[in-house]
């Protein structure tokens, strides 16, 4: 059976019917259906005016405008809001009421596309394998990225979140039109990886999607990840404005100027340095979602009531942090280079700025505990990877799972850890599943492009597609049309159960309490450490002060602090402007090397970015108490400039007041309502509070945005605020 021309709200569309084998099964493929009008720079997306006749939807459209991997030119187009649909068909009747899976790609909110990289004439995000093996409809789409998708002044002049609103437009289009393609508009599952996983999470939390989403899967990224929310967008907006010659003194004039600036110039005004970094890479990614008071009405930690009826899977790869650790500390992938205590201490101190010397020392001690027993370079390098994996992915994901579970009504929660090792031949043997390694298996690459894959890779892929599509059908990854290798139990606050996905799966694959000691450390011990003031000294490495980090700014100064000079051993200043900064790491669809044997550039789509607001405390141990998140606006300062502004400033040491209080048993005390700048962080309601979803506040055309404090502009963000 085949669909032929399908009538949508925009008009008729015609795709291609691709026959599969001799049994008469086929898949209808539609590429390049517009779901919104061509975009206007830094404006919300608008409905597409439609067309007459029948639109031939046979080719992918261009990605949204973005910088190339070398960051010296652009590709893509402003007219980019298109989606793609794969509909599996049997022999006789056309499909009806199929579950729908909508993919949101990653790429640091900076790059990517709905089709992904092309290898062997097969695109990374080609939905055919998922659709046909799982009997679901797959939808992928483009959304705006980088400055065009996320630049914000932090107020109504440029509220930001344009890329998130593009995503919402696509989801709403699917809801309204997918029945005509044979889909069930009441059974939509979002899934995505990295920035896409975080986007999935944010979409479930936004009041704009009320009633649109039934289920969601976040792979290696959640709304609480420390790189997802930009707390000082004005800082970044001004950097771009300066670069393109717009006035920065008045936000309204700056906004008007930015809107009429050549979009290519806006895109190229922002560069991410990747070598000689003074600070961890995630400090440098600035154009990400913001709390705009409307689409994202409050800190994500306070929005989990909005996802109370949405079934949720979230998980990470066991070495998600590897690609970032190897950028922050290149010795990790080099057999002839050593990671020293000083190196690691410096890295730790840069991630723990707000907790000062105690934060750095305590964290360093916790992570290096195994070094006395096993001082091998392999162990030390693994520790660095584990540290970044924990901070950037694992801990925020665990907290998101706990939050979802605590707020869920009928919704189910599932957790996983993907551990099938990377296929990258250039990596050391000890490397596990790196960031984005999971994507190729979810999209069935071992079947679509068998060259370079082994039977065990097909086993992993088959299992993931089965779990993912069963979940989309029923809300339970074990139940559906596809057999699964072992039973995946739901995550609860009591068991903290998770499924480990590997090539050999059985009853022992269901595990409990992943990295509990480290989770406890971040959410209890670290959290309880006092936040240091701007006047206090920044951490000094244990081996003297030869590697002392520059002193953070302490006032309203717009100028960045000068890094140490001479032979202090300070790291080099990151490249600025057009100095030939090295390329951004491969991002899943760039087509750039390094290419794994499968060619699908399973390389990471998402460098983490920015400062997400303190995640909550997940349950620890058998108390069964729901996680207690901090909620106050800690006013995370901005991320450093990466253009021609000179060296980036050092992160501040924070002035957010006392840390949030972790759960201390079954107190039964009522939740405290946030009261602004209180010295103690308020505790929002958790669990089955029955709290209504947080609504948008104000008109979406000019969303209210929490004001940002210009006085903090020269500061860097506190990356971890658990």
């Amino acid at each position: 059976a085949k669909l032929g021309a399908v009538y949508t709200e925009g008009g008729f569309v015609e795709g291609v019917n691709k026959k599969l084998g001799l049994l008469g099964d086929s898949v209808d493929i539609f590429k390049g259906i517009p779901f919104a009008a061509p975009t206007k720079a830094l404006e919300n997306p608008q409905p597409h005016p439609g067309w007459q006749g029948t639109l031939k939807a046979k080719n992918f459209k261009k990605r949204c405008l973005q910088a190339t991997i070398t960051q010296d030119s652009t590709y893509g187009d402003e007219d980019c809001l298109y989606l793609n649909i794969w509909v599996p068909q049997g022999r006789k009747q056309v499909s009806r009421d199929l579950p729908v899976m909508i993919w949101i790609y990653g790429g640091a909110f900076l790059m990517g596309s709905g089709h992904g990289a092309n290898f062997l004439n097969n695109y990374l995000y080609d939905g055919e394998e998922i659709a046909t093996r799982g009997n679901v409809i797959v939808v992928t789409f483009n959304y705006r990225v980088g400055p065009l998708g996320f630049l914000s002044t932090g107020d109504a002049n440029l509220p930001g979140n344009y890329g998130l609103r593009d995503q919402h437009m696509a989801i709403a289009w699917v809801k309204r039109n997918i029945a005509a393609f044979g889909g069930d508009p009441n059974n939509i599952t979002l899934f995505g990886e990295s920035a896409g996983g975080a986007s999935v999470s944010l979409q479930t939390l936004s009041p704009y999607n009320k009633g649109l989403i039934r289920r969601a899967i976040s792979q290696s990224g959640v709304a609480l990840s420390p790189w997802v929310i930009q707390k000082n967008p004005l800082f970044w907006a001004k950097k771009v404005a300066e670069k393109v010659g717009c006035p920065v003194g008045d936000a309204a004039r700056m906004a008007q100027c930015l809107k009429v600036t050549d979009p290519r110039a806006l895109t190229l005004a922002y560069k991410v340095p990747l070598a000689g970094l003074e600070y961890p890479m995630l400090h440098y990614v600035g154009f990400v979602p913001v709390i705009d008071g409307d689409f994202i009405p409050a800190d994500p930690i306070n929005l989990y009531a909005n996802a109370a009826d949405i079934d949720y899977i979230a998980g990470t790869n066991n070495m998600d942090g590897h690609i970032f650790a190897s950028i922050d500390m290149p010795a990790i992938n080099k057999g002839n280079k050593k990671v020293t205590e000083e190196d690691f201490y410096k890295l730790v101190s840069e991630f723990t700025i707000t907790k000062g010397l105690r934060g750095a020392k305590t964290t360093f001690d916790v992570y290096t505990e195994s070094w006395a027993q096993d001082p091998s370079q392999e162990n030390k390098k693994k520790t660095v990877v584990d540290f970044e994996t924990d901070v950037l992915f694992l801990v925020p994901t665990e907290i998101a799972l706990a939050q979802h579970r605590a707020n869920a009504k009928s919704a189910k929660t599932y957790a996983y850890l993907f551990s099938h090792p990377s296929r990258m031949p250039v990596y050391p043997k000890w490397v596990g599943a790196d960031h984005a390694d999971d994507i190729q298996y979810v999209f069935g690459k071992p079947f679509a492009t068998p060259t370079g894959y082994r039977p065990q890779d097909r086993t992993v892929s088959k299992a993931m597609i089965a779990y993912w599509t069963n979940f989309a059908k029923t809300g339970d990854p074990n139940m559906g049309d596809s057999a699964v290798p072992t039973h995946w139990e739901p995550y609860t606050t009591e068991n903290s159960g998770y499924l480990e996905i590997t090539k050999k799966m059985g009853s022992s694959s269901m595990k409990r309490s992943l990295r509990t000691n480290f989770l406890r450390y971040w959410t209890l011990t670290y959290l309880a450490l006092p936040t240091v003031t701007d006047q206090e000294a920044t951490p000094v490495p244990p081996t003297g002060d030869s590697e002392a980090t520059p002193v953070p700014p302490t006032g309203d100064s717009e100028t960045a602090p000068v890094p140490p000079t001479g032979d202090s051993g300070a790291p080099p200043v990151p490249p600025t402007g057009d100095s030939g900064a090295p390329p951004v790491p491969p991002t899943g669809d760039s087509g750039a090397p390094p290419v794994p044997p499968t060619g699908d550039s399973g390389a990471p789509p998402v460098p983490p970015t920015g400062d997400s607001g303190a995640p909550p405390v997940p349950p620890t141990g058998d108390s069964g108490a729901p996680p207690v998140p901090p909620t106050g606006d800690s006013g995370a300062p901005p991320v450093p400039p990466t253009g021609d502004a000179g060296p980036p400033p050092v992160p501040p040491t924070g002035d957010s007041g006392a840390p949030p209080v972790p759960p201390t048993g079954d107190s039964g005390a009522p939740p405290v309502t946030p009261t602004g700048d209180s010295e103690t962080a308020p505790v929002p309601p958790t669990g089955d509070s029955g709290a209504p979803p947080v609504p948008p506040t104000g008109d979406s055309e000019a969303a209210p945005v929490p004001p940002t404090d210009d006085s903090k502009e020269a500061q860097m963000p506190a990356v971890i605020r658990f």
Epitope: V6, E9, E14, P49, W51, Q52
Partner: antibody, heavy 119, light 105 residues
Framework: QVQLVQSGAEVKKPGASVKVSCKAS????????MHWVRQAPGQGLEWMGV????????SYNQKFQGRVTMTRDTSTSTVYMELSSLRSEDTAVYYC????????????WGQGTLVTVSS | DIQMTQSPSSLSASVGDRVTITCRAS?????LNWYQQKPGKAPKLLIY???SLASGVPSRFSGSGSGTDFTLTISSLQPEDFATYYC????????FGQGTKLEIK
Amino acid sequence: QVQLVQSGAEVKKPGASVKVSCKASGYTFTSYNMHWVRQAPGQGLEWMGVINPGDGATSYNQKFQGRVTMTRDTSTSTVYMELSSLRSEDTAVYYCARDYYGSSPLGYWGQGTLVTVSS
Amino acid sequence: DIQMTQSPSSLSASVGDRVTITCRASSSISYLNWYQQKPGKAPKLLIYAASSLASGVPSRFSGSGSGTDFTLTISSLQPEDFATYYCHQRSSSPTFGQGTKLEIK
């Protein structure tokens, strides 16, 4: 100017079929979708389906699926709507309506054809 | 299918009055149109895309709204405006509101 002229009133017995025509003029026939909308006596408007006169592609309201067929004759710039297995509740005025532009609303309407189903 | 609910279903007003008719969609929509129908006549397009005036329609008619809530406003009723008004959403399965009959008081 755009004109849509429909065929005359019909009286049919239950179980029979009716075929209503709509002749278009004043524009390029194949360039705009044509919709059919019906209105039962004293009731509201109900969308039945749409045809693209260019390639003959159709889409029908699920309610009428299997009973309605829309066709076109490009040589006479005419579209047809045939409804089978008529029942008394199909008694209504049937309108053809052309898109205004793009996926815009129904900007031009025929005068309507009354179909009465009675035994 | 998306349900469209108009309110009120009927109203009485006088020449010169300002009148507002509302239309609510059961879920968010992109395209909303308004039609006027007089007895024995075909409907006539008034407003498309929520707020755009169709050609030849007097400026006393205006439309607004987005998402799920929309309004049609007639700023100063004229004798020829007494008719039935329908809202219409344009998705892959278009639907109409049940109509609002505007009568002379």
